[in-house]
Each structure stands twice: as C-alpha cells, then as structure tokens.
Interface confidence: low
C-alpha cells in the first residue's frame, strides 16, 4: 500500500474579517494510526490551531466527523477570522506512539489572507481659527485595513484637492494597516458652508467608499467689515449713529460705542441676520444728543470679534456754535478712518 | 472578451422561488461589484442592489429587502439573484451589470451588462 | 432618494438630424452620470461615463455634457441604429437611480 500523504488542495484561502475560513485537508490512507493537528507557520516557534486528541479549541470546528473509524478529512473551520489569524496553516498528521505521537507528515500549507475594512476615516483640522486666505492643514486617519493597498482622496465641496501627503503604516508586512494624510487648504471668505471631505477606498468597500468630514466652520474666523454712517432724526438735536458690522463669523461679537475715546455703551451680538454664505451681519446705534456737545464729537464704534485684537471705525460729528443750524443734514461729517 | 452570461427565462406560479445565475467571462468576478437591475415589461429600470464580489456582502435597494438575496460561488465565476414568494408584480427583466467596484474614475457606472433573464410569474 | 427626470420622453428625428437629450438630477452628483442605451429585447449598453466621457467603442457622434445637476446626451449625425430608449443614471448617491428614459423614433 502507498505512504500516507496529506494533501492540502488549497495554495491560499482569501477570508473578509469576521468571516469563517475553511482550511481543507485529507490523507489518503487510513494508517499509519495516529492524530491530525493543525498548526499556525512551521518550525519550532509554530502555533497549535487544533488538535484531534486533546485540548479545548473554541474557534475551531471539524467539517467531518473525526470520531469515525474510516474519516480521512480533517478539514477545520476557524470563525470570527481578524487580520491577526493571517499566515500559513498546516495539517499535519502524527504516528500514535509510546509517551508520545510521533510527526509522521505534514502538508504543504495553506495560505490564509485576511481581508479587512479601513475604519471610518477620521478628519480632524487645526486647533485655532483661521482667517482667509491662510492655508490649514486637515488629518485624516483609518485603520485596521488588509491588505495594504488603499486609495485616498481629499475633497473640498466636491472638488478635488491635490495638496495632501499620505503615508501607509507599516512600511514592511504586517496583519493589517493604517492610512495618514495631510492635506492643505487655502479658506476662502466664502467657506463658512465648505466641507473638507476624506476618501478612502479600499478591496473590501466595493460598493461605496468610506467618507469622513470635517466643516470649514470649525475653522475658519471671518473678521467683520465696520461701516459707521449718521441717519438723519427728526429731532433737532438729536443724531443717530449706526454702525453697520457685516460679513463676521463666528458670531461670537462684542461691540463697545466711545465718546471721545470714553465708553458710552456696550453690547454683545445677539439679533444678528446671516448671509447665504454663512457669515453675520449686525447694526448697532447710538443717539447722540448734540446739545449736550459744546465741542466736536468723535464717536467710535469697536468691535472685539472671537476673542481677537479690536478693530474700530471713527465718525465726526461736527457741533456748529449757532445750535438752529443743527440739522440732520450738516450736523456731521464721516471721516472713514478705520483704526486698531 | 468580457461577458456575463445569465441562465434562461423561468416561468413561475405565485409563492414559488426563482435563482437567475449570473456568470462572469474574461475577468476575474472578484474584481468589481456584481449589481442587479430589475426592468418590469414596458418599464425603466430601477437599481436592485449590488453584492460585494470580495466579501460576499449584499446591499439592498429599499424596495428589495427580505425576499431577494445576492449569494456568490467565485469557484465557478458566477453570481446568483434568489427571489422568494414571488409575486405577479415580479414579474420583469432582471439583469446583472458589473461596476467598478469603489468610486473610481467611472465609479458606479455600469459598463457591462447580462443579456437579461425574463422571470415571468404566473398562475 | 435622488429623482433623475429626462426629457423629452419621447422624440421623432431623421437620419442625419442632431438630437440632445436632458437628464436633470433633484440634487447635486457632480459627474458621476452616466448614458445607457437600449434597444427592444436587448440589455442596456453603456455610452457615456463620468457625464462626459465615452467608453470604448462607441462613436464620436455621441457626447455628453453637464455636471451637478443639468446633463445632456447629444447625438449629430443620427444613424438608423441609434433609434433606441436613452437612459440616465447617477452613481453620487445610494440608492443608484435611472431617469424613465428618452425613446428615440424614427420620423
């Protein structure tokens, strides 16, 4: 009769994570007698996946009945497959003897890859506000994913980005992976609705790519514009000045009226209305009553926008020595001075 | 040259089950997505799902959830459409079309297409 | 779900004629649109992918144009083969969705 082999038909087996894998084996002979293991790689470091005679192997089950007298498939079933059960696994069929079996022969190994999904990417962007025209840089990570090859694309409202340097993790072989991108991005006034979106596709996402997001309004600062104009009031010695806060964001926006450089009132942004583009626009205004004025008024309207340097605009207000010629007409006088 | 080969047309009774098989030719099943395509007689057509080719995962379109299943044998290169406790408003073309798989270039444009296997459901 | 809708459904031309077909998605799918044809008793055929460009194999008489949310399928110099139904799809969003298709008659 010929010599036992043990045949393992399959080179490779290529498993998803959290799938079972079927590693399959048979002998062609029935004797010598003896127990099938199965290990994990091969020489004196390999690791014992299953063993026929003893021992408690909860991941593993057997496609036939190895209890029957004239079973010749020894064939096992590993579930709840991750990256780390990746390597070679052999059948290997030991010869009963006396303390202990003896290694009889082996197969020639069956190759399991583990194909894993990349994590949801994760897109964080700077710390600190930025203002227009500055460039900021966004991460983007995901992990877990087998095997190595991954694509990853960066988006800014649908367009996209070229600016970006990627970096797979580890560089060697490895039971799985992970992906690291930065990606530069000029703000723009208008990006207060942008979105800075992360691509990555990989083997195992065939149907859609895995997306992760992050809203340019966490980012960007828009410093506001400040306009102060005089508004004409029916009462003679009565002048209204409003100052006109535009295109700001985020809302967050405290302005303070002066009065020859001394306070007269300040208030904090509340009813603002918004702009399509997603920045704020707020008025304030002061009534001045120019009789209680024997000098030129300056008023000043400073504005702190989130927690940044004031920036104000001045108005003069021009106090005439004959009070009847005090009308809303030639009362004042805009200087536009913008100051810090 | 690439191909999907479906089987033959199947006429069903009411409540009976259908499995229209979808075979790949000239590339490798695996590589793209395997999607499904239900034309009803004098209709348009609307998309049913597609399985993931890699790992075996379906996704259903909303209205084909429970009674459809996408299922794969990559040994013999082929994808299979099961339609259970068929219906007369099943009654339709159904075709499978490859797509790339994850958003490419052409992403989830269908470039291949089966000749199309007409279930008709009938008592 | 996004609602593709074409229009015309239906229109007579001749051989010779140039045609433009409009597809117009309910929200943006930047250019990932594709063309399909058809024709009786047969499986769709793939033309135009990425809103403008044509696979391999099909004639330069058909071009596609558009992006977001207005595309077209023209036609110039139509040929007796190209009386068929035209689809769209959009390949943005699940579910994928088709328009109810253009079907193109001879005059």
């Known amino acids: 009769e010929e010599e036992l082999q043990v045949i393992q038909p399959d080179k490779s087996v290529l498993v998803a994570a959290g799938e079972t894998a079927t590693l399959r084996c048979t002998a062609t002979s029935l004797i010598p007698v003896g127990p099938i293991q199965w290990f994990r790689g091969a020489g004196p470091g390999r690791e014992l996946i299953y063993n026929q005679k003893e021992g408690h192997f909860p991941r593993v089950t057997t496609v036939s009945d190895l209890t029957k007298r004239n079973n010749m498939d020894f064939s096992i079933r590993i579930g709840n497959i991750t990256p780390a059960d990746a390597g070679t696994y052999y059948c290997v069929k030991f010869r009963k003897g006396s303390p202990d079996d003896v290694e009889f022969k082996s197969g020639a190994g069956t190759e399991l890859s583990v194909r894993a999904k990349p994590s949801a990417p994760v897109v964080s962007g700077p710390a600190a506000r930025a203002t227009p025209q500055h460039t900021v840089s966004f991460t983007c990570e995901s992990h877990g994913f087998s095997p190595r090859d991954i694509t990853l694309k960066w988006f800014k409202n649908g367009n996209e980005l070229s600016d970006f340097q990627t970096n797979v993790d580890p560089v060697g072989e490895s039971v799985s992976y992970s992906i690291h991108s930065t990606a530069k991005v000029v703000l723009t006034r208008e990006d207060v609705h942008s979105q800075v979106i992360c691509e990555v596709a990989h083997v195992t996402l065939q149907g859609d790519p895995l997306r992760g997001t992050a809203n340019l309004s966490e980012t960007i600062r828009v410093p506001p514009t400040l306009e102060v104009t005089q508004q004409p009031v029916r009462a003679e010695n009565q002048v209204n000045v409003t100052c006109q806060v535009r295109k700001f964001y985020p809302q967050r926006l405290q302005l303070t009226w002066l009065e020859n450089g001394n306070v007269s009132r300040t208030e904090t942004a509340s009813t603002v209305t918004e702009n399509k583009d997603g920045t704020y626009n707020w008025m304030s205004w002061l009534l001045v009553n120019v009789s209680a004025h024997r000098d030129d008024v300056k008023l000043t309207c400073q504005v702190e926008h989130d927690g940044q340097p004031a920036v104000s605009k001045s108005h003069d207000l021009k106090v005439s020595a004959h009070p009847k010629e005090q009308g809303s007409n030639t009362a004042a006088e805009n200087t536009g001075s913008n100051e810090r | 040259q690439i191909q999907l080969v479906q089987s033959g047309s199947e006429l069903k009774k009411p409540g009976a089950s259908v499995k229209v098989s979808c075979r790949a030719r000239?590339?490798?099943?695996?590589?793209?997505?395997m999607n499904w395509v239900r034309q009803a007689p004098g209709q348009g057509l609307e998309w049913m799902g597609f399985?993931?080719?890699?790992?075996?995962?379906?996704t259903y379109a909303q209205g084909f959830k429970g009674r459809f299943v996408f299922s794969l044998d990559t040994s013999v290169s082929t994808a299979y459409l099961q339609i259970g406790s068929l219906k007369a408003e099943d009654t339709a073309v159904y075709y499978c079309a490859r797509t790339r798989g994850y958003y490419d270039f052409d992403g989830g444009a269908f470039d291949y297409w089966g000749q199309g296997t007409l279930v008709t459901v009938s008592s | 779900d996004i609602q593709m809708t074409q229009s015309p459904s239906s229109l007579s031309a001749s051989v010779g004629d140039r045609v433009t077909i409009t597809c117009r998605a309910s929200?943006?799918?930047?250019?990932?649109l594709a063309w399909y044809q058809q024709k009786p008793g047969k499986s769709p055929k793939a033309l135009i992918f990425?809103?403008?460009y044509r696979y391999i194999g099909v004639p330069s008489r058909f071009s596609g144009s558009g992006s977001g949310t207005d595309f077209t399928l023209t036609i110039s110099n139509l040929q007796p083969e190209d009386f068929a139904t035209y689809y769209c799809?959009?390949?943005?969003?699940?579910?994928?969705?088709f328009g109810q298709g253009t079907k193109l008659e001879i005059k």
């Open positions: 990425s809103a403008i």
């Open positions: 000239g590339y490798t099943l695996t590589d793209y997505a």
């Open positions: 399985i993931n080719t890699y790992t075996g995962e379906p």
């Open positions: 799809q959009q390949y943005n969003t699940y579910p994928l969705t």
């Open positions: 929200q943006n799918v930047g250019t990932h």
